[in-house]
């Protein structure tokens, strides 16, 4: 897979492959994988990709299912890159406060908050 | 502050306090704090709260500015609790795949993806 493929296209293709290979992937009846109990997905990327690793090790490889796991690995790479960018730029306090305000604003309106 | 306050109310109050104390917080002209360079805030919670810690250590405490940092500390506690819930429940593969599909779907529609 060329890594030049835009991440957005990669995600779309991965969703399609996930649907295509679902029957093969669920063949292992006894396998148990940690599943987050809330929908704030970005908080759980580490656990999600650990689960993908577990699934990959239990899945017979070959054909386009390999492409699925390759895609998922590229998505992980993208997310790891995003995580690196969390602390790259050192800025004045006013800019940090604007980011913090935006973060709390998004938390206020978009997060699924269970008290 | 009673910890029984719903997290959503806590976030709202914190946004208001942040606005109230902005002038005091930005008084340190030379302080630099890492600011994430993308809008996928949940990926950066660790760095955001490290920045808050830096800011708190440089801010003269007293009055309602203390309440601001106390609130932020409770929000951190809530997020840490959410992170713990990422790997608590072990489920069958089909359930993991449902979560993965939802994660990729959200990534596809809601994340800000820069290729």
């Amino acid at each position: 897979i060329p890594t030049e493929i835009p991440t957005s296209a990669l995600v779309k293709e991965t969703l399609a492959l996930l649907s295509t290979h679902r029957t093969l992937l669920i063949a292992n009846e006894t396998l148990r994988i940690p599943v987050p109990v809330h929908k704030n997905h970005q908080l759980c990327t580490e656990e999600i990709f650990q689960g993908i690793g577990t699934l990959e090790s239990q899945t017979v490889q070959g054909g386009t299912v390999e492409r699925l796991f390759k895609n998922l690995s590229l998505i992980k790479k993208y997310i790891d890159g995003q995580k690196k960018k969390c602390g790259e730029e050192r800025r004045r306090v006013n800019q940090f406060l604007d980011y913090l305000q935006e973060f709390l604003g998004v938390m206020n309106t978009e997060w699924i908050i269970e008290s | 502050i009673p910890t029984e306050i719903p997290t959503s109310a806590l976030v709202k109050e914190t946004l208001a306090l942040l606005s109230t104390h902005r002038t005091l917080l930005i008084a340190n002209e030379t302080l630099r704090i890492p600011v994430p360079v993308h809008k996928n805030h949940q990926l950066c919670t660790e760095e955001i709260f490290q920045g808050i810690g830096t800011l708190e250590s440089q801010t003269v405490q007293g009055g309602t500015v203390e309440r601001l940092f106390k609130n932020l500390s409770l929000i951190k506690k809530y997020i840490d609790g959410q992170k713990k819930k990422c790997g608590e429940e072990r489920r069958r593969v089909n359930q993991f795949l449902d979560y993965l599909q939802e994660f990729l779907g959200v990534m596809n529609t809601e994340w800000i993806i820069e290729s």
Epitope: E89, R91, D98, Q101 | V37
Partner: antibody, heavy 117, light 109 residues
Framework: QVQLQESGPGLVKPSQTLSLTCTVS??????????WSWIRQHPGKGLEWIGY???????YYNPSLKSRVTISVDTSKNQFSLKLSSVTAADTAVYYC?????????WGQGTLVTVSS | SYVLTQPPSVSVAPGQTARITCGGN??????VYWYQQKPGQAPVLVVH???DRPLGIPERFSGSNSGNTATLTISRVEVGDEADYSC???????????FGGGTKLTVLG
């Protein structure tokens, strides 16, 4: 490498609204490490800061221009804009857009706007 | 609001040292940024955070800041250094940006 490009009319009539757009390429306007700013320079004079905006929409304006200035951002187009209302000949200047981290890192080449009837 | 004062012009012979000042109330407590602007061009940062040089800016450019005055020093001045130089600070009480009026550096001869 981030590049900025101003666009808009070079001639505006007195009492009308000056409108300029800055298109950002080579980087995202949603970059949390930057504000997006407008600066102007009257002929033969120094630089005058007009205002800046954060991707979230937070704005900061020069107090002397605040009543006439609006800066907005369109993250989907990777653009930000300046509107200056009720212009007079005194608003004739070269207008620059720039990215603002701890300092002004990247600048547009500037566009001359003349206010004249 | 905060005010920065620069001399309108400074003249210096090639090879000499030029000093351009920027005055402001207790400016030493702020970070100062210096920009060079040549005719028909956008400004370019030459010194940030009082005395740090961006990549590509010659070592001949240096800065200092204390008390009520910040200074941009250009040693071994060259003809190509002829330009307008502006200082800039942040006014943290308001989150506003403030520029000095600019200084025209003329290289004699």
């Amino acid at each position: 490498q981030v590049q900025l490009q101003e666009s808009g009319p070079g001639l505006v009539k007195p009492s009308q609204t000056l409108s300029l757009t800055c298109t950002v390429s080579g980087g995202s306007i949603s970059n949390g490490g930057y504000y997006w700013s407008w600066i102007r320079q009257h002929p033969g004079k120094g630089l005058e800061w007009i205002g800046y905006i954060y991707y979230s929409g937070s704005t900061y304006y020069n107090p002397s221009l605040k009543s006439r200035v609006t800066i907005s951002v369109d993250t989907s187009k990777n653009q930000f804009s300046l509107k200056l209302s009720s212009v007079t000949a005194a608003d004739t200047a070269v207008y620059y857009c720039a990215s603002l981290g701890n300092w002004f890192d990247y600048w547009g080449q500037g566009t001359l706007v003349t206010v004249s009837s | 609001s905060y005010v920065l004062t620069q001399p309108p012009s400074v003249s210096v012979a090639p090879g000499q040292t030029a000093r351009i000042t920027c005055g402001g109330n207790n400016i030493g407590s702020k970070n100062v940024y210096w920009y060079q602007q040549k005719p028909g061009q956008a400004p370019v940062l030459v010194v940030h955070d009082d005395s740090d040089r961006p990549l590509g800016i010659p070592e001949r450019f240096s800065g200092s800041n204390s008390g009520n005055t910040a200074t941009l020093t250009i040693s071994r001045v060259e003809v190509g250094d002829e330009a307008d130089y502006s200082c800039q600070v942040w006014d943290s009480s308001s989150d506003h940006v403030v520029f000095g009026g600019g200084t025209k550096l003329t290289v004699l001869g």
